[in-house]
């Protein structure tokens, strides 16, 4: 099933201690899906979308950026025929960096 879209959303982190907010959204015909956020291939967080919504926002506490390394991806799962779980393709990667403040 098609990959979700992924995006870092504001407020954006300015240091590694700041929280990170990452939204993940399934295509239009998959509301209420279960979403998994990965970083460097490891599971970071799981969330379920409301039954009338296509997406979720993962809120990662400060320091989540430190390990493991690599970009974030997300994936969703839905119940298919015969109540079998179907997993989507992985989203595109999204990178998080911490800009040098411009004084």
């Amino acid at each position: 099933i098609p990959a979700p879209s992924i995006r870092l959303v504001p407020p954006y982190p300015s240091s590694q201690e700041d929280p990170i907010h990452i939204a993940c959204m399934a295509p239009g015909n998959f509301p209420g899906a279960n979403f998994t956020l990965y970083r460097g291939g490891q599971v970071v967080q799981l969330l379920q979308a409301p039954t009338d919504q296509r997406g979720v926002t993962f809120n990662l506490s400060g320091g989540s950026s430190k390990a493991p390394g690599g970009p974030f991806h997300c994936q969703y799962g839905v119940l298919g025929e015969l109540n079998q779980s179907q997993l989507s393709d992985l989203s595109e990667p999204v990178n998080v960096s911490f800009p040098v403040p411009t004084w």
């Epitope: 504001p10 959204m25 295509p27 239009g28 919504q53 296509r54 997406g55 911490f98 403040p101």
Partner: antibody
Framework: QVQLVESGGGLVQPGRSLRLSCAAS????????MHWVRQAPGKGLEWVAV????????YYADSVKGRFTISRDNSKNTLYLQMNSLRAEDTAVYYC?????????????WGQGTLVTVSS | QSALTQPRSASGSAGQSVTISCTGT?????????VSWYQQFPGKAPKLLIY???HRPSGVPDRFSGSKSGNTASLTVSGLQAEDEADYYC??????????FGGGTKLTVLG
């Protein structure tokens, strides 16, 4: 106060290139995602591209994908749109706009726009 | 990337209310709450009026309100004033990285 000032528009022949700039002031530019939105004469708004606060993630409308490149220089508080292989249908006023500070709070600040005319 | 559907025009008398609709699909307007409304005067840049369906930025009069039902979002302008005469655009995300606009609605305030 927040200011976004576009420049670089003008008359250009089909197939040629143009680079637009958007100079930002009055806010911490490096903390905001930035968009380009265009409006053909007498027509509605059309989203063109977005770039993340740090420049690492960029997305484009299908109509400009492969021809336009959005970029930013946070040290200069400036957003850019490199437009290649221009077509007559790219004729429009091009606006830069900043995302809100909160989640999905819309495009809360806009520049005054710069007119790009593609014609032979 | 087809535009969201808005009526081309709307009108109302001063003091009355008018509602402008914005119809999409379950893939955009109906699938989340990331709907915004913008006001644009001729020759000027758009101005944000409503975000996340019904939230007003500071400085926007409470005469402007937003709502959503199913795949249709609505902007209501109550207590119409002459200075409300402008073009109004809705926007929504088709996916997280693809912003769509409606075709725009020209609002006319009658005598």
């Amino acid at each position: 106060q927040v200011q976004l000032v576009e420049s670089g528009g003008g008359l250009v022949q089909p197939g040629r290139s143009l680079r637009l700039s958007c100079a930002a002031s009055g806010f911490t530019f490096s903390s905001y995602g930035m968009h380009w939105v265009r409006q053909a004469p007498g027509k509605g708004l059309e989203w063109v591209a977005v770039i993340s606060y740090d420049g690492s993630n960029k997305y484009y409308a299908d109509s400009v994908k492969g021809r336009f490149t959005i970029s930013r220089d946070n040290s200069k508080n400036t957003l850019y749109l490199q437009m290649n292989s221009l077509r007559a249908e790219d004729t429009a006023v091009y606006y830069c706009a900043s995302e809100g500070v909160d989640f999905w709070s819309g495009l809360d600040y806009w520049g005054q726009g710069t007119l790009v005319t593609v014609s032979s | 990337q087809s535009a969201l559907t808005q009526p081309r025009s709307a009108s109302g008398s001063a003091g009355q209310s008018v509602t402008i609709s914005c119809t999409g699909t379950s893939s955009d307007v109906g699938g989340h709450n990331y709907v915004s409304w913008y006001q644009q005067f001729p020759g000027k840049a758009p101005k944000l009026l409503i975000y996340e369906v019904s939230h007003r930025p500071s400085g926007v009069p409470d005469r402007f309100s937003g709502s959503k039902s199913g795949n249709t979002a609505s902007l209501t302008v109550s207590g119409l004033q002459a200075e409300d005469e402008a073009d109004y655009y809705c926007s929504s995300y088709a996916d997280l990285n693809n912003l769509m606009f409606g075709g725009g609605t020209k609002l006319t305030v009658l005598g």
